[in-house]
Amino acid sequence: MAVTACQGLGFVVSLIGIAGIIAATCMDQWSTQDLYNNPVTAVFNYQGLWRSCVRESSGFTECRGYFTLLGLPAMLQAVRALMIVGIVLGAIGLLVSIFALKCIRIGSMEDSAKANMTLTSGIMFIVSGLCAIAGVSVFANMLVTNFWMSTANMYTGMGGMVQTVQTRYTFGAALFVGWVAGGLTLIGGVMMCIACRGLAPEETNYKAVSYHASGHSVAYKPGGFKASTGFGSNTKNKKIYDGGARTEDEVQSYPSKHDYV
């Protein structure tokens, strides 16, 4: 019962985590304009992995996709890749874990096969969570570096007469969503791995036999040794193929060059 609960909870936690990773990847607010210690502007800038947006005080919001692939910073490309890998692994993990759930009966699937699949999905969730956390952390590091660089030359002017206020960016909501989601996926993966241990078939060498010694009413139960040969030793290895994930930016009518944070 505890195993089923652990496995089910692991699945639900991972499902929430992966949904969060997908949400974070799609969100536009990875970096938002820093409002602290800045002149109050009637324009608010924020940027995501796929496009940058500007919200005017009037209520009008304009977003532009990043059209160039080669013109984007390598770090941004790396973050995109990490998030997509995290989503793909998580999605495959969810698919595998559905069939591995103890509460779901599929034909005459053995417990050893379910244990193997539970472990596979657990590992996938752990890697997926780590990818998301890594991706968000790389982006956050990029923001911190650029923040202090722009703070160093916050005001660049011509002879001190005309000033240009440099837009500084700080952590957006997507970063926190990504961190929490990555953590949940990681926790879910660990729970699946723990559940897997309980799912592994217990093979004992001896049947429990009661020995009744004369004059004594004490029962001896020898054995109790687990003779398992490790996880998945008696199941066939299954190859899981990834068809590859492609993301296309939505087509906008006016391409523009963007200096990314």
């Epitope: 500007v54 005080s57 009037s58 209520g59 005309v162 240009t164 060059k257």
Partner: antibody, heavy 118, light 113 residues
Amino acid sequence: DVQLVESGGGLVQPGGSRRLSCAASGFSFSNFGMYWVRQAPEKGLEWVAFITSDSTSIYYVDTVKGRFTVSRDNPKNTLFLQMTSLRSEDTAMYYCGRTGYGNAMDYWGQGTSVTVSS
Amino acid sequence: DIVMTQSPSSLTVTAREKVIMNCKSSQSLFNSGNQKNYLSWYQQKPGQPPKLLIYWASTRKSGVPDRFTGSGSGTGFTLTISSVQAEDLAVYYCQNNYFYPLTFGAGTKLELN
């Protein structure tokens, strides 16, 4: 057709109060930020205040901060400017305006005149 | 506060003449996020409220004649009337739409010779 009609202007004594109203029609009022701009006799335009569509952000020019309060009633399609501690330099034609692209005032009312004099 | 300086303060022109008026801001009104300049131009005729002509420094409001052209970037902007008509005689104001308070220039008065 977009229409903005200001009312509530008139003669006020220094230190007195006045509440200006701006009735909007012909557009979805609750979706637009709104401005108040004034123009002293034979002078240029002076931006006074701004309120976002949902009233979450309000901004004032320094000369009216603490004395003027801008508010709006979206269901009634009305914008307000509550003016207190009025001074002679507040004498002006007060215009309400709707914000459009680029935070510009794309539509203006005809204005209401406020005269602060003893 | 951002200071908007308009020049000249008044212009005396003849019909069908090309007119250029300037507006300078004390800080850049350019937003790197969308590559736009947050400056607008208004026309005010005597006894009337102002009327928006140009926003985003160069985008004409619908219904505004194409003889009105806005240009410039950062801190320097111009409004050009390619061929002045009698109905164009008015005061023209530029406005900072980027930093609060959204200050106006003192205006350029266009008069007929």
